[in-house]
Interface confidence: low
């Protein structure tokens, strides 16, 4: 974390000679330049008076299959490549005999990374060019000569975004279990500035360090049932694309403005992280937008402050935590970090201190779960399917892929007795292994609530007694009154809400007179219109990054860069009593309904947004006329 250059060295370390255990099909005789790294590998390290056996597995989910690398060619033009069939040497795993251990290492040129045993975080790196069997230093983070690094996100900026900080919110979960929800995925785009490139010296060195960093971040987030997948890397090997200032808040603003301009031609990602070689002012090593994940402001800046890449990985995990709605631990009354006090703090501590953190506190987890309840977090739900992953289906990667019935992670991590973790098939006698309607390896009985009603435009869902998954999310019938509007496909769209979505909390709908005209390209008011279903007109708030605006009097409309298209009032927005915008015109609510749908539901259900019967607990679709138990008995079906 020390800003001093060259990088600080270790104060105290132990020299070890790792020994690779012979394993099946380990291609030791092949020349190393072929880059054939085995799927699994194990090493024995003698350190701190113990022999640690590390069992490692290649992180197959490190790169998305659409992964790109962007850099500047010798002729000055920007080049984007999609490296094909990349073999890599980044591994994750555990330490034999230590139940809650973790390891994240690269084996590209010797062993480099970390392994955690209990509260002890051991860092390892080569001392010479002797490869994996050569001399390595094993040390603890507190023995890295460095000064404390802090996060630039201030308490003021957090307060309004995160709501009240009461200890009551943070009820620790029993045991050390993962949150019982679907895995979430962050599709990450990393930008490396010119100062970092100069410091590392080549594109290859930058690529190696970034993959190492993302591998570590992914390992840290796995404990929260998250995966971090790198979808793009941009290396500014010639010059910076925007000014990287020693003031991290300026740099973050510049990053987000630049990103907004680039979004249409670069990767569609969930989050962007800058790694910089610039020394930020004071002790700050990172800065992020709070609760911005999945929005245009989803990003952070990180100073590469330590010799060991675990340092910037911890900073990135921390700043990404802010993007995911987390506050600093010390700001939360009653926040518990399970770490031994002398071993250091948790990841969301405001300053890192002398040792690298390795876990998230209870309150960070509570903030995260609360963020995931917001509609905005939907971008994290899309699991990369087979085609996103380099290397095809892999049993143990937490993705249920072709030929698998379940996937609960590697055998050492799997705590799901319903799933045979070595074959990714259901255990004997199990009906299911995953899903909201799966309990103790059996499908829950029909009628059990599996998805509660989120808001007034939502409907609750119940298990059907046959499937381990909760039925598809359904919403109130379009046109059902909701706060200030009418439900439309699960939302309650109003002009005020749309303006806030674009212009922030201060955004409001403009005066009614603003909606009286359509706007032609070039900000010219055109013909009179009789309703409020044309261009979205707002006032107040902050101009969205990377968007051009068209101002006529007090009316603000968002336009594309070339001024040819305007942000329209969305379908379903209330435009008067019993009226909604539909196909660009203000029309009667009955445009939503072709018939009296609810009458077909036999008083045991209501109509949903698809004009289908949504049955009460225990009743069978499509018309809620029969009990699910009768239907199942008649078909004699098991799940």
């Amino acid at each position: 974390i020390a800003p001093s250059r060259p990088w600080a060295l270790m104060e105290q370390y132990e020299v070890v000679l790792p020994w690779r255990l012979p394993g099946p099909r380990v291609r030791r005789a092949l020349p190393s330049h072929l880059g054939l790294h085995p799927e699994r590998v194990s090493y024995v390290l003698g350190a701190t008076g113990h022999n640690f056996t590390l069992h490692l597995r290649k992180n197959r989910d490190l790169l998305g299959s659409g992964y790109t690398e962007t850099y500047t060619a010798a002729n000055g033009s920007e080049v984007t490549e999609q490296p094909r069939g990349q073999d890599h040497c980044f591994y994750q795993g555990h330490v034999e005999g230590y139940p809650d251990s973790a390891a994240s290492l690269s084996t590209c040129a010797g062993l480099r990374g970390f392994f955690q045993v209990g509260s002890d975080l051991h860092l390892i790196e080569p001392l010479d060019e002797g490869g994996e069997g050569g001399r390595h230093a094993v040390y603890q983070a507190e023995h890295l000569l460095q000064t404390a690094g802090t996060c630039g996100v201030s308490d003021d900026s957090l307060g309004s975004l995160l709501g009240p900080r009461t200890a009551a919110v943070f009820r620790p979960r029993p045991g050390d279990s993962l949150p019982s929800r679907e895995t979430r995925y962050v599709e990450l785009y990393v930008v490396v500035d010119n100062a970092e490139f100069q410091m590392l010296g080549s594109e290859a060195a930058v690529r190696h360090r970034v993959l190492e960093v993302v591998n570590h971040v992914d390992k840290l987030y796995q404990k929260l049932n998250f995966r971090v997948v790198l979808v793009g890397l941009e290396i500014w090997n010639s010059q910076d694309r925007f000014h990287v200032s020693p003031d991290p808040s300026v740099t973050l603003e510049n990053l987000l403005t630049w990103q907004a301009r680039q979004r249409t031609r670069r990767h569609l990602h969930d989050n962007v992280q800058l790694i910089t070689g610039v020394d930020f002012t004071g002790t700050t090593v990172g800065f992020a937008r709070v609760s911005a994940m999945c929005s245009h402001s989803s990003g952070a800046v990180n100073q590469d402050h330590s010799k060991n890449p675990v340092g910037v990985a911890c900073t990135m995990a921390h700043e990404m935590g802010h993007n995911l709605g987390m506050d600093h631990d010390e700001n939360v009354q009653g926040c518990r970090c399970q770490e031994r006090f002398e071993a250091g703090r948790c990841i969301m501590a405001g300053s890192i201190g002398s040792s690298f953190p390795r876990m998230f506190s209870d309150c960070s987890q509570a903030y995260l779960e609360s963020f995931l309840e917001r509609p905005q977090s939907v971008c994290l739900a899309n699991a990369p399917d087979l085609s996103h992953l380099v290397g095809g289906p892999v049993c143990g990667n937490l993705f249920v892929e072709r030929g698998e019935q379940c996937d609960c992670g590697p055998p050492e991590d799997c705590r799901n007795r319903c799933c045979n973790s070595t074959t990714c098939q259901l255990a004997e006698g199990a009906q299911c292994a995953h899903g909201t309607c799966c309990q103790e390896c059996k499908v829950k009985p029909a009628g059990e609530l599996c998805r509660p009603k989120k808001d007034m435009c939502d409907l609750e869902e119940f298990c059907d007694g046959r499937h381990p998954e909760c039925p598809e999310d359904a919403f109130q019938e379009n046109g059902t009154p909701c706060s200030g509007g009418y439900c439309y496909n699960g939302a309650c769209p109003t002009l005020a809400q749309q303006c806030q979505a674009f212009w922030g909390p201060g955004g409001q709908a403009a005066e009614e007179s603003c909606f009286s005209y359509d706007i032609l390209p070039g900000c010219k008011a055109s013909r009179y219109r009789a309703d409020m279903c044309g261009v979205l007109q707002c006032k107040g708030g902050q101009q969205p990054l990377g968007r051009a605006i068209c101002i006529v009097d007090v009316c603000h409309a968002l336009t594309t860069e070339d001024g040819t298209a305007y942000e329209p009032v969305p379908e379903g927005t209330r435009c008067g009593p019993e009226k909604v915008c539909w196909k660009g015109r203000c029309q009667d609510l009955h445009v939503y309904r072709s018939s009296n749908c609810s009458a077909q539901c036999h008083n045991h259900g209501v109509c949903n947004h698809k004009q289908e019967c949504h049955c009460h607990a225990g009743w069978a679709p499509p018309h809620c006329a029969k009990l699910l138990t009768e239907v199942h008995a008649a078909s004699g079906s098991l799940p």
Partner: nanobody, 121 residues
Framework: EVQLVESGGGLVQAGGSLRLSCAAS????????MAWHRQAPGKQRELVAA???????NYLDFVKGRFTISRDNFKNTVYLQMNSLKPEDTAVYYC???????????????WGQGTQVTVSS
């Protein structure tokens, strides 16, 4: 609006090759899928090949192994490499783009004017 301009069609002998290109311009946001369809005289239009945002591809059985669809994400261009052409491949080939204005918003679909491919025996 989105404009799609196809090129590369023409007359070719059976067994020959052609490469179709389709360049998209205009108000492009989040492209979900780019595809090629074709319509032979007196027949229904059929999907020939499609490529998803995540590079996943999908082909009409009849052209599998002979045709390859690819895209350049940074030029918003889709290509159809057609090898071992057969007379039955004769048709007007249409480019199709499906996009969203924002993640999870409704899908919009756009079509090109079509390019004629004629395979003589």
């Amino acid at each position: 609006e989105v404009q799609l301009v196809e090129s590369g069609g023409g007359l070719v002998q059976a067994g020959g090759s052609l490469r179709l290109s389709c360049a998209a311009s205009g108000n492009i946001f989040r492209i979900e899928t780019m595809a090629w369809h074709r319509q032979a005289p007196g027949k229904q239009r059929e999907l020939v090949a499609a490529i998803r945002r995540d590079e996943m591809t999908n082909y009409l059985d009849f052209v599998k192994g002979r045709f390859t669809i690819s895209r350049d994400n940074f030029k918003n261009t889709v290509y159809l490499q057609m090898n071992s052409l057969k007379p039955e491949d004769t048709a007007v080939y249409y480019c199709n783009l499906i996009q969203r204005r924002a993640p999870y918003s409704r899908l919009e679909t756009y079509w090109g004017q079509g390019t004629q491919v004629t395979v003589s025996s």
